[in-house]
């Protein structure tokens, strides 16, 4: 089968990292510098992605695989394949069209990216606010007021919630 396929299309024998060169009687030529072919039988090599500006190279291009980019310090990736870099803000802020702005009262952001989110409404779960919220932290809800009646055992505050993990950028 391989032999038959080769007779039909000589390019099918060209492995990844090469291309079928029409200028040279369809022989398999290595990909030119800064280009790659990730599959066999290609008639052109794809030019490598260049990580420029706020992008930096996470993985170098090879003759068989494209480069991968991430973002320079102070920025984070957005979108599949890190198609864009977005400016970091401080915790307690969100990025707007006019730059980083503090979270409005009643909202918080515990990361360097994303938007400010409203504090948890403890009363919706029949609980009370144990620790007030800040721009950087959500409120901590405690037992309902009924649970705090005289004679009830003393309340041990819950351990602080773990911060969400940040993927390395």
């Amino acid at each position: 089968f391989e032999r038959t396929r080769s007779l039909q299309d000589p390019c099918s024998n060209c492995p990844a990292g090469t291309f079928c060169d029409n200028n040279r009687n369809q022989i398999c030529s290595p990909c030119p510098p800064n280009s790659f072919s990730s599959a066999g039988g290609q008639r052109t090599c794809d030019i490598c992605r260049q990580c420029k500006g706020v992008f930096r190279t996470r993985k170098e291009c090879s003759s068989t695989s494209n480069a991968e980019c991430d973002c320079t310090p102070g920025f984070h990736c957005l979108g599949a394949g890190c198609s864009m870099c977005e400016q970091d803000c401080k915790q307690g802020q969100e990025l707007t069209k006019k730059g980083c702005k503090d979270c409005c009262f009643g909202t918080f952001n515990d990361q360097k990216r994303g938007i400010c989110r409203p504090w948890t409404n403890c009363s919706l779960d029949g609980k009370s606010v144990l620790v007030n919220g800040t721009k950087e932290r959500d409120v901590v809800c405690g037992p309902s007021p009924a649970d705090l009646s005289p004679g009830a055992s003393s309340v041990t505050p819950p351990a602080p919630a773990r911060e969400p993990g940040h993927s390395p950028q």
Epitope: Q50, K52, A80, G81, S83
Partner: antibody
Framework: QVQLQESGPGLVKPSETLSLTCTVS????????WSWIRQPPGKGLEWMGY???????NINPSLKSRVTISVDTSKNQFSLKLSSVTAADTAVYYC????????????WGQGTLVTVSS | EIVMTQSPLSLPVTPGEPASISCRSS???????????LDWYLQKPGQSPQLLIY???NRASGVPDRFSGSGSGTDFTLKISRVEAEDVGVYYC?????????FGQGTKLEIK
Amino acid sequence: QVQLQESGPGLVKPSETLSLTCTVSGGSISSYYWSWIRQPPGKGLEWMGYIYYSGSTNINPSLKSRVTISVDTSKNQFSLKLSSVTAADTAVYYCARDQSGGGSFQHWGQGTLVTVSS
Amino acid sequence: EIVMTQSPLSLPVTPGEPASISCRSSQSLLYSNAYNHLDWYLQKPGQSPQLLIYAGSNRASGVPDRFSGSGSGTDFTLKISRVEAEDVGVYYCMQALQTPPTFGQGTKLEIK
């Protein structure tokens, strides 16, 4: 091998919106950046903007208020909308595969002429 | 926006003779990874542009080796060692360092 094909009306009235679609065949749209470039008759090339398959866009500042680029990965297509057109927008419109987000346009469509006239 | 300037704008050449086109950018296209973000394109009559050279000097796969690119920073040259009839068309340089990418005005190569 990758092929691109532009489609859309060849005639648009002034002040209306020009809409074009580029269909990608022979490869998935789900990688690389995808650009629109135009060329007024007898003149040079102007890059309009790109989109990544995830939907991130970058538009030429000279056109930013009028250009929208969108992508439909299920159809392997991306689209251009240019609003409030005038005669100056008469051009051949090309779609192209952009290797680096604003550089090295390795694969081009054959182009489609759009005339703005009443 | 980076401005690209080409010369000459018209280039009559005898088949078999060499040809040279110059391209200058308003700022350096050499990036920190020692990569010059400059492409050369040829638009043959009635056709779409096609990529000839990327990164200043790398020939795109399938491009005949009579085409070569050289230069660094702000000054670049496209050379054709022996012009053939099929090389007629408009040649454009383009900077790919910053968005928006910008093209030169084009150089029209014609056969004498």
